[in-house]
């Protein structure tokens, strides 16, 4: 706490300007009117205040707005935003995308801080859903943002917002998240033609069920191996050799190079050796010819 002291004669600030950088902390506290500061917040960013001086300015705003800052002030916080705690931010009601952008810009190039996470959470909750413009903004600043959300949070993403998602935005998503996003993407891109559809849906296929993969295999999509290996193992295992060959096209050759990794390894073990031989890759480990395959999970379900 800065001690309450009277402002020295002639030092009362009439506006927020560069002369204030020469004020001691107690002088800023005594001589800068909080209401003036609030109306001239946009000037603070242009003035090279020290961290200690910024602490004083924050303190003045906290006193003026104990229930939380109004958006007119929040939008112009600039570097003062870095002084805010998640507790401070939870008091705010941020509704403007411009305000959100302005504050994200302050933190640009850094990891998502607890303050930013709280700000985004408040903003999205206030809007009720992750609309396309918000998603566009958030993924532009934080490509991994989408994958930081829980499956429950992702369920509020409307299919229309999926158009804003870039492949790199999904790099760190796990299968549970893709399970939620894939049906939305399927819906969003449903009116596109075959090759265009595949380009758009490709990044989301980690959430695709077997029947959709079978359908894709009939469309000459030539899925690359990196995409294939991100598919759900349980979705890949039922695919036949012919279906995988059609799905991967020329990239099926790469199964040999990746035969020790899942889901390739598990898939190989499920195929008949005769069928694997048709791939011309020398893949081994398939079911020997003449052996009968029993699906024990089906047997248990029947008993």
């Amino acid at each position: 706490e800065v001690e309450k002291t009277a402002c020295p004669s002639g030092k009362k600030a009439r506006e927020i300007d560069e002369s204030l950088i020469f004020y001691k902390k107690w002088e800023l506290e005594a001589c800068v009117d909080a209401a003036l500061l609030a109306t001239q917040m946009d000037r603070v960013n242009a003035i090279p205040f020290t961290y200690e001086q910024l602490d004083v300015l924050k303190h003045k705003l906290d006193e003026l707005y104990p229930q939380g800052y109004p958006e007119s002030v929040i939008q112009h916080l600039g570097y003062l935003f870095l002084k805010m705690s998640p507790e401070d931010i939870r008091k705010w009601n941020v509704t403007s995308l411009e305000t959100l952008k302005a504050l994200l810009e302050v933190n640009k190039g850094h990891e998502m801080s607890p303050q930013v996470a709280t700000l985004i959470d408040r903003f999205v909750k206030g809007r009720g859903q992750l609309d396309k413009d918000t998603l566009d903004t958030l993924t532009a600043f934080y490509p991994g943002y989408l994958c930081s959300l829980s499956p429950e949070e992702l369920s509020s993403v409307p299919p229309s917002s999926i158009w804003a998602v870039r492949p790199q935005d999904l790099d760190t998503c796990d299968p549970r998240q893709l399970d939620v996003l894939y049906p939305k993407a399927r819906l969003a891109f449903q009116n596109m033609n075959g090759s265009e559809y595949f380009v758009k849906i490709q990044s989301f296929l980690g959430g695709a069920p077997t029947e959709d993969l079978k359908a894709l295999s009939q469309q000459n999509v030539s899925m690359d191996l990196a995409t294939f290996m991100k598919l759900r193992t349980d979705a890949v295992l039922p695919l036949t050799v012919a279906e995988v060959q059609k799905l991967l096209g020329p990239h099926v050759e790469g199964l040999k190079a990746e035969e020790r990794h899942r889901p390739v390894r598990d898939w190989i073990l499920r195929q008949r050796q005769d069928d694997l031989d048709t791939l011309g890759l020398g893949l081994q480990g398939g079911i020997p010819n003449g052996y009968l395959v029993l699906d024990l999970s089906m047997q248990e379900a029947l008993s």
Epitope: D224, K230, H251, E253, A257, G280
Partner: antibody
Framework: EVQLVQSGAEVKKPGASVKVSCKAS????????MHWVRQAPGQGLEWMGN????????YYNERFMSRVTMTVDKSTSTVYMELSSLRSEDTAVYYC??????????WGQGTLVTVSS | DIVMTQSPDSLAVSLGERATINCKSS????????????LAWYQQKPGQSPKLLIY???TRESGVPDRFSGSGSGTDFTLTISSLQAEDVAVYYC?????????FGGGTKVEIK
Amino acid sequence: EVQLVQSGAEVKKPGASVKVSCKASGYTFTNYWMHWVRQAPGQGLEWMGNINPSSGDSYYNERFMSRVTMTVDKSTSTVYMELSSLRSEDTAVYYCARSGGLWLAFWGQGTLVTVSS
Amino acid sequence: DIVMTQSPDSLAVSLGERATINCKSSQTLLNSVSQNNYLAWYQQKPGQSPKLLIYFASTRESGVPDRFSGSGSGTDFTLTISSLQAEDVAVYYCQQHYRTPYTFGGGTKVEIK
């Protein structure tokens, strides 16, 4: 020892076709895909396509899609690459190359195809 | 198509010195599941067929001298010849085998200074 022996040099007129062969030995022929790559004089390498020697399925670079055909004769462990509607810019050395997984582990000696009127 | 950009176009290095060739792809070549980078390096000596040196960006093909090494991940890759020998005079190519059409870099000519 893996060996890929290609057919000899060819001189063709524009509009004609050429068929280059690549005879493989020293390994199980049906266990490795074969690729074709070409190199114009003084230029870099260009991938043309690949073929599964077990099934005969082939895949082509779209640049050559309408003009190239790759085939296989398992009885002689030979793959063929036929390029039709030849033009002067098809003058190049054509290589067959055996896959090592995805990369090209063994290369033939190359076949020079000259297209000239 | 994935574009492969090699630099420099040519390189003159003294015998016994290090030669470094760079290759940049227009999109990632990393398989995030297996952590393999789908990039190979080839050496082509004058009048000869290309020869495989490195695959998966850093795995040396058997029989290739250990002065050749590959590094990098994602979109940026490097081939290093730690101590250049006279027999290393050649053109070196990188190639992506992530997605068809498989594409090559323009080549880097390595000569003796």
